[in-house]
Amino acid sequence: SIPWNLERITPPRYRADEYQPPDGGSLVEVYLLDTSIQSDHREIEGRVMVTDFENVPEEDGTRFHRQASKCDSHGTHLAGVVSGRDAGVAKGASMRSLRVLNCQGKGTVSGTLIGLEFIRKSQLVQPVGPLVVLLPLAGGYSRVLNAACQRLARAGVVLVTAAGNFRDDACLYSPASAPEVITVGATNAQDQPVTLGTLGTNFGRCVDLFAPGEDIIGASSDCSTCFVSQSGTSQAAAHVAGIAAMMLSAEPELTLAELRQRLIHFSAKDVINEAWFPEDQRVLTPNLVAALPPSTHGAGWQLFCRTVWSAHSGPTRMATAVARCAPDEELLSCSSFSRSGKRRGERMEAQGGKLVCRAHNAFGGEGVYAIARCCLLPQANCSVHTAPPAEASMGTRVHCHQQGHVLTGCSSHWEVEDLGTHKPPVLRPRGQPNQCVGHREASIHASCCHAPGLECKVKEHGIPAPQEQVTVACEEGWTLTGCSALPGTSHVLGAYAVDNTCVVRSRDVSTTGSTSEGAVTAVAICCRSRHLAQASQELQ
């Protein structure tokens, strides 16, 4: 019967006794940087070309005996997971292997860098179709390795890496921490994070998504027909490399940003038990398990958005945190979050010709996060309209006044440490959805965009009594672009988007009174693109 991991990534309409997805990734080449491999295993023979690239350190220990099957174990298994005939994800993908890990599974940053350069040169000499590079390795944070990954990604190569098996924040490791790389954590058959001895999968904001990574059956280098079960984020990354190969084979023109957005969009949502992660990492870690799209074509009409968390600002009074979108993405909204609730809001600002989301810590605060909502919006023209703090008691307001521009997000930022928390909440006048409303002491920022066929609407959900969390979701066919809290409440920790749901978090209810200021309203801005929908219908 079908191995559990292949069943897990397969949409229900393709499920059968055998895993036979519609396109095997035949137009894509996957580079594997790992150990040596047993290329004559019948699972991968003829599918994997062993390049002459080898850059590995000496094995440790005088009593170490090289045994071919042990040296090849990790790489052979991963090659099988990506493109194996029988237990592989992308059965049509061809692979090239580069040896950057020795027989003990150890490598060097310099060896990996030279390997990446080898791929870049190969690509220049003989351009082929889409390229996926699988980096099933993790070492300490390396600015130089991350920079090399960025360069290769900007040359159009899709890089997929393991989050690491240290039960730690993936941002502390490379290449997992490189923003341009698709970083993959590991889950098991119960969709729970994988435990590996006393350690386990890495987590945190640098992880893009999770994938099957425990008891994964794959080619064993022991013999030509042998199979073995292995576990780890390397196996998880191999699944995503395979899924990416299939998506790119179906749509070869996909950019890295489009591919990442699709991987996120088609993932299974909210199935991971977050209790496994450290409490401070739960909100930062994506609750996504990779899956193949239900159809390899026709996803182009959707407005895709993802949430990008910044690094923590740190606790100093004037500390800020910045969240950035990928070069091909539009920043459609910006929000902030602080566990202590002490923050001075957030603003969208230009940096290097691109909008970024900046959150501001407040005096006595433990630090803030900036949260960017990053979307794929072709031909978009977006700008930020700012209203300074108002004199009137009605609060500050700003709207999108340019013809054809629609509101995609609201941010508010204040200079004062205390917003006058005992003022009654400000209510938005009905029938004015295209404007942002805030405290009179705050400056308000509206993200206004013009794009063909773009339409947006505001959706609110208010709860009169104090709640730790208030949510509002966009309905089917609409995509969440903006998430904020209606002003007037003292205990809001911040707002952020989780998939298509806007989440507004408040302080522990027991610490706040149930006065009128206890009311919390979550405000979602939901958008869709009629232009994208029409374009896709024309293609079909």
Epitope: R42, S224, F227
Partner: antibody, heavy 119, light 113 residues
Framework: QVQLVQSGAEVKKPGESLKISCKGS????????ISWVRQMPGKGLEWMGM????????HYSPNFQGQVTISADKSISTAYLQWSSLKASDTAMYYC????????????WGQGTLVTVSS | DIVMTQSPDSLAVSLGERATINCRSS????????????LAWYQQKPGQPPKLLIY???TRESGVPDRFSGSGSGTDFTLTISSLQAEDVAVYYC?????????FGQGTKVEIK
């Protein structure tokens, strides 16, 4: 039920070409390997090679490499064994058998095709 | 190539008696990754194709009578017919399926004494 049905017996002259077949039914033909096994009169079993119909990957025994060609047509769930120029020493019973990645032994065999090469 | 050697070449056993066939491989077919022996036993009756009896050296194929059993590990294996029946008259082959080319033993002919 699962079965492999082979084409009928053949009598050929040396130098002639021949293609015998093995049709699978009752299972997903593309997901199983098909091997060909030779048994010369009064002798034992010799593995000749195999094919994976899913992608037409083949692997031959060195003893048979270049002597025969294994192919498959997955649209009709059929594997083939062919000779471009038969020799008298090719006289034998030829069996096809299937195996699976997690069960790499031959659990189902065809009934055999007797090939006689004689001038 | 892994060479499979069976002994004896032929065996005559009385009905109801035990028949034992040995098979030796030139290199181990036991693999640490899954702790399995990549060895099978087949029975071939006159005019019929071979039939799978035992796989993974000791696992009986469904429908095979329990008088057939396989044992051994690494390089030395045994097929035992605990109580020979008339219908067991056949040639028995061991096979390794771990490495290419796949190889068979030369066969052991079992007859009734």
């Amino acid at each position: 039920q699962v079965q492999l049905v082979q084409s009928g017996a053949e009598v050929k002259k040396p130098g002639e070409s021949l293609k015998i077949s093995c049709k699978g039914s009752g299972y997903s033909f593309t997901n199983y390997y098909i091997s060909w096994v030779r048994q010369m009169p009064g002798k034992g079993l010799e593995w000749m090679g195999m094919i994976y119909p899913g992608d037409s990957y083949t692997h031959y025994s060195p003893n048979f490499q270049g002597q025969v060609t294994i192919s498959a047509d997955k649209s009709i769930s059929t594997a083939y064994l062919q000779w471009s120029s038969l020799k008298a020493s090719d006289t034998a019973m030829y069996y096809c058998a299937r195996d699976y990645w997690s069960k790499p032994y031959f659990d189902v065999w065809g009934q055999g095709t007797l090939v006689t090469v004689s001038s | 190539d892994i060479v499979m050697t069976q002994s004896p070449d032929s065996l005559a056993v009385s009905l109801g008696e035990r028949a034992t066939i040995n098979c030796r491989s030139s290199q181990s077919v036991l693999y640490s990754s899954n702790n399995k022996n990549y060895l099978a036993w087949y029975q071939q009756k006159p005019g019929q194709p071979p039939k799978l009896l035992i796989y993974w050296a000791s696992t009986r194929e469904s429908g095979v009578p329990d008088r057939f059993s396989g044992s051994g590990s690494g390089t030395d294996f045994t097929l035992t017919i605990s109580s020979l029946q008339a219908e067991d008259v056949a040639v028995y082959y061991c096979q390794q399926y771990s490495s290419f080319p796949i190889t068979f033993g030369q066969g052991t002919k079992v007859e009734i004494k």
